[in-house]
């Protein structure tokens, strides 16, 4: 799957949306690697 910074950001946004924003405070694009998905 795509591991560019932009892909990671969009994937994380989708994850946050589906979870209702209930995630760890440090779960942000610049802190998570592609392995988080």
């Amino acid at each position: 799957s795509c591991n560019t910074a932009t892909c990671v950001t969009h994937r994380l946004a989708g994850l946050l949306s589906r979870s209702g924003g209930v995630v760890k405070d440090n779960f942000v694009p610049t802190n998570v690697g592609s392995e988080a998905f």
């Epitope: 560019t4 932009t6 950001t9 969009h10 946050l16 942000v28 694009p29 610049t30």
Partner: antibody, heavy 119, light 107 residues
């Protein structure tokens, strides 16, 4: 309100260097990657590279590798793009841009910085 | 590098027209494509990400579709403020690359 405010226009001579700044506000600067894109007169957009402001990691377009340097000052929430060994073909508008999730999911762009390279 | 080929390079249309712009990638980019609108002297404005998702605040007349190598931006009913240049971008692979642009002009 999320804002990316860039430094003013620059005129440089061939062979010189230029450093463009991009001051971020309205969001957590270190949470999101910063991209740099340029557009020469009448040309398509061209991606220069991106930087992770949290760790300082960078990705560069090979076309600019060795000439472009992306850095950040976390304490000032400011990103920088330095381009060295300037030539006339580097005359362009340079933009910073960042896709933000919080507070608003959007792709924000700076207003652009015109760099003119002329002898 | 992945080449993004946009067509047409320019088109003339009237207010109310349905406008379709296409973008072809030189290799598979999945759905990792964005569309931008740019007006003279202004920074690009993001419209679409992940091929078909509109950013908040983007009018519903703008829609995107496609996957793999073929992508489309459609403006269902052209408005006066839509006359601009439109660019596609792939972000599936580094370096990110843009199409050559489609200038939408008033007929």
């Amino acid at each position: 309100e999320v804002q990316l405010v860039q430094s003013g226009a620059e005129v440089k001579k061939p062979g010189a260097s230029v450093k463009v700044s991009c001051k971020a506000s309205g969001y957590t600067f270190t949470d999101y990657y910063m991209n740099w894109v340029r557009q020469a007169p009448g040309q398509r957009l061209e991606w220069i590279g991106d930087i992770n402001p949290n760790q300082g990691g960078t990705n560069y377009n090979q076309k600019f590798k060795g000439r472009a340097t992306l850095t950040v000052d976390k304490s000032a929430s400011t990103a920088y793009m330095e381009l060295s060994s300037l030539r006339s073909e580097d005359t362009a508008v340079y933009y910073c841009a960042s896709i933000i999730i919080v507070p608003n999911y959007f792709d924000y762009w700076g207003q652009g910085t015109t760099v003119t390279v002329s002898s | 590098d992945i080449q993004m080929t946009q067509s047409p390079s320019s088109l003339s249309a009237s207010v109310g027209d349905r406008v379709t712009i296409t973008c072809k990638a030189s290799q598979n980019v999945d759905t990792n494509v964005a569309w931008f609108q740019q007006k003279p002297g202004k920074a690009p404005k993001s419209l679409i990400y992940s091929a078909s998702y509109r950013y908040s605040g983007v009018p519903s007349r703008f829609s995107g579709s496609g996957s793999g190598t073929d992508f489309t931006l459609t403006i269902s009913s052209l408005q006066p403020e839509d006359f601009a240049t439109y660019y596609c971008q792939q972000y599936n692979n580094y370096p990110y690359t843009f199409g050559g642009g489609t200038k939408v002009e008033i007929k």
